[in-house]
């Protein structure tokens, strides 16, 4: 079953290559287990950036080597992606799945265009 998902259209990563955005979903029922996936679309290719499954009221748990962190509050998730470089500029899509209890719902946002600008190297100070 389909579900509405909203996210910002554009986000600019900071000088340390970190970008944060909110992913909000219209929960149609009492889900207790939710899965959030961040997908990156660039040059018509879609790749998974990170994913986390969480129980309502608990923290999101990404894999230890994940570049993502996040927190949840109700039906919104605050996502942070770290270690971004200019080459990582692209459309980052939030996918939300209500895993339990049935029925299963899935929604995909329109994507957040994340712009990453590599910082200029500091000039040598002689």
């Amino acid at each position: 079953k389909a579900m509405h998902v909203a996210q910002p259209a554009v986000v600019l990563a900071n000088s340390r290559g970190t970008a944060s955005f909110v992913c909000e979903y219209a929960s149609p029922g009492k889900a207790t287990e939710v899965r959030v996936t961040v997908l990156r679309q660039a040059d018509s290719q879609v790749t998974e950036v990170c994913a986390a499954t969480y129980m309502m009221g608990n923290e999101l748990t990404f894999l230890d080597d994940s570049i993502c962190t996040g927190t949840s509050s109700g039906n919104q998730v605050n996502l942070t992606i770290q270690g971004l470089r200019a080459m990582d500029t692209g459309l980052y899509i939030c996918k939300v799945e209500l895993m339990y209890p049935p029925p299963y719902y899935m929604g995909i946002g329109n994507g957040t265009q994340i712009y990453v600008i590599d910082p200029e190297p500091c000039p040598d100070s002689d």
Partner: nanobody, 126 residues
């Protein structure tokens, strides 16, 4: 801090109609999605309708779709639930709840709401 107060409940005959109001006596409601729920004696709390911050997004479970309509007037800091063709099984205590969100969506899950009113009794009986 929003504080919610429901009103408009009462005794109504089967087939009749009622309009419930949910007003905030604290913060402005325009930053909050609002949901209506009811609890019948001896039953779990049931979702009825929700409306996003701007009013453009609404959602209903199949059980009340077509009979219940949720609207909001942000200028009056109030959300309304219009109920028509009421049945005996609509009897219960009706609660509104609020959740601060970033975008325009809303949730039908009671788990997502952190601020609740005290409720207003609706009795459908001849």
């Amino acid at each position: 801090q929003v504080q919610l107060v429901e009103s408009g409940g009462g005794l109504v005959q089967p087939g009749g109609s009622l309009r419930l109001s949910c007003a905030s006596s604290g913060d402005t409601l325009e930053s909050f999605a609002v949901g209506w729920f009811r609890q019948a004696p001896g039953k779990e709390r049931e979702e009825l309708a929700c409306i996003g911050r701007t009013g453009e997004f609404t959602d209903y479970p199949g059980s009340v779709k077509g009979r219940f309509t949720i609207t909001r007037d942000n200028a009056k800091n109030t959300v309304y639930l219009e109920m028509v063709n009421l049945k005996a099984e609509d009897t219960g205590v009706y609660y509104c709840a609020a959740e601060r969100l970033v975008f325009h969506l809303c949730s039908l899950s009671e788990y997502d709401y952190d601020t609740w009113g005290q409720g207003t009794q609706v009795t459908v009986s001849s």
